[in-house]
């Protein structure tokens, strides 16, 4: 696996946080510059899950 090293040192452009197209259960992680499994949030007062939006005071679900 180590042979497929991501050369992050040479790819630190300012667009590193621009998301690529990920599938429905994933999101783009700028740290690893790839799509990763992404969890939804749990809104304590409603019990609903949602995508995290800026400014919302949500807590993540316990564990995964």
């Amino acid at each position: 696996m180590g042979a497929r090293r991501l050369r992050v040192r040479s790819q630190r452009s300012r667009d590193s946080s621009v998301p690529t197209q990920c599938n429905q259960t994933e999101c783009f992680d700028p740290l690893v510059r790839n799509c990763v499994s992404c969890e939804l949030f749990h809104t304590p007062d409603t019990g609903h899950t949602s995508s995290l939006e800026p400014g919302t005071a949500l807590q993540p679900q316990e564990g995964s």
Epitope: M1, P30, R33, S37, C38, F41, E53
Partner: antibody, heavy 125, light 107 residues
Framework: EVQLVESGGGLVQPGGSLRLSCAAS????????IHWVRQAPGKGLEWVAW????????DYADSVKGRFTISADTSKNTAYLQMNSLRAEDTAVYYC??????????????????WGQGTLVTVSS | DIQMTQSPSSLSASVGDRVTITCRAS??????VAWYQQKPGKAPKLLIF???YLYSGVPSRFSGSGSGTDFTLTISSLQPEDFATYYC?????????FGQGTKVEIK
């Protein structure tokens, strides 16, 4: 229950090698990045390396590059840190940790949510 | 690499005090900052991620703020179990880097 358990630490002479293991349970490592972080006695946290097992991407701290190799075996749900050419300054408690991501408008908002208990590596003659 | 400069390196406070710890990044990292608490002999625990989001199970007396280069962790009313060392970490660009830590001690 999510759990990470490190093993493989011990006493080794300068120039020697060790292989640390990080056995995960309660989640599949292929879906997250797995990180090694170390802490020298009385010092702060120092990130060492990460691996994204789903694609094999890796990165390393400059202080270990060329000496340490991070890898993962998804069939065993285990990550590894192969440490070669060890130096006295590599003496530390080594932790593995999972990076969790929450969906923030399609981009990861996250941190290292689960950590192992740590394994001590002592490099001394 | 992005440097995370944390201040103060240590502080003394009493139970009930409001405590503020700051972290400055050497370049713009948006809101990609997490805060951790560590007690002696234990692994770190995630408190805050994405600069201002409280991790599950963390008491609401902890809060985070900031974006760009300046970030703050606040403990609104210090409790006995909060005496520990706190670290910030950026995760915008690899390598992820930690601040040097802030030790919160009993006055």
């Amino acid at each position: 229950e999510v759990q990470l358990v490190e093993s493989g630490g011990g006493l080794v002479q300068p120039g020697g090698s060790l292989r640390l293991s990080c056995a995960a349970s309660g989640f599949t490592i292929s879906s997250s990045s797995i990180h090694w972080v170390r802490q020298a006695p009385g010092k702060g946290l120092e990130w060492v390396a990460w691996v994204l097992p789903s694609v094999g991407f890796t990165d390393y701290a400059d202080s270990v590059k060329g000496r340490f190799t991070i890898s993962a075996d998804t069939s065993k749900n285990t990550a590894y840190l192969q440490m070669n050419s060890l130096r006295a300054e590599d003496t530390a408690v080594y932790y593995c940790a999972r990076r969790v991501c929450y969906n923030r408008l399609g981009v990861c908002a996250g941190g290292m949510d689960y950590w192992g208990q740590g394994t001590l590596v002592t490099v001394s003659s | 690499d992005i440097q995370m400069t944390q201040s103060p390196s240590s502080l003394s406070a009493s139970v009930g005090d409001r405590v503020t710890i700051t972290c400055r990044a050497s370049e713009d990292i948006s809101t990609a900052v997490a805060w951790y608490q560590q007690k002696p002999g234990k692994a770190p625990k995630l408190l805050i991620f994405a600069a201002s989001y409280l991790y599950s199970g963390v008491p609401s007396r902890f809060s985070g703020s900031g974006s760009g280069t300046d970030f703050t962790l606040t403990i609104s009313s210090l409790q006995p179990e909060d005496f520990a060392t706190y670290y910030c970490q950026q995760s915008q660009i690899s390598p992820p880097t930690f601040g040097q830590g802030t030790k919160v001690e009993i006055k």
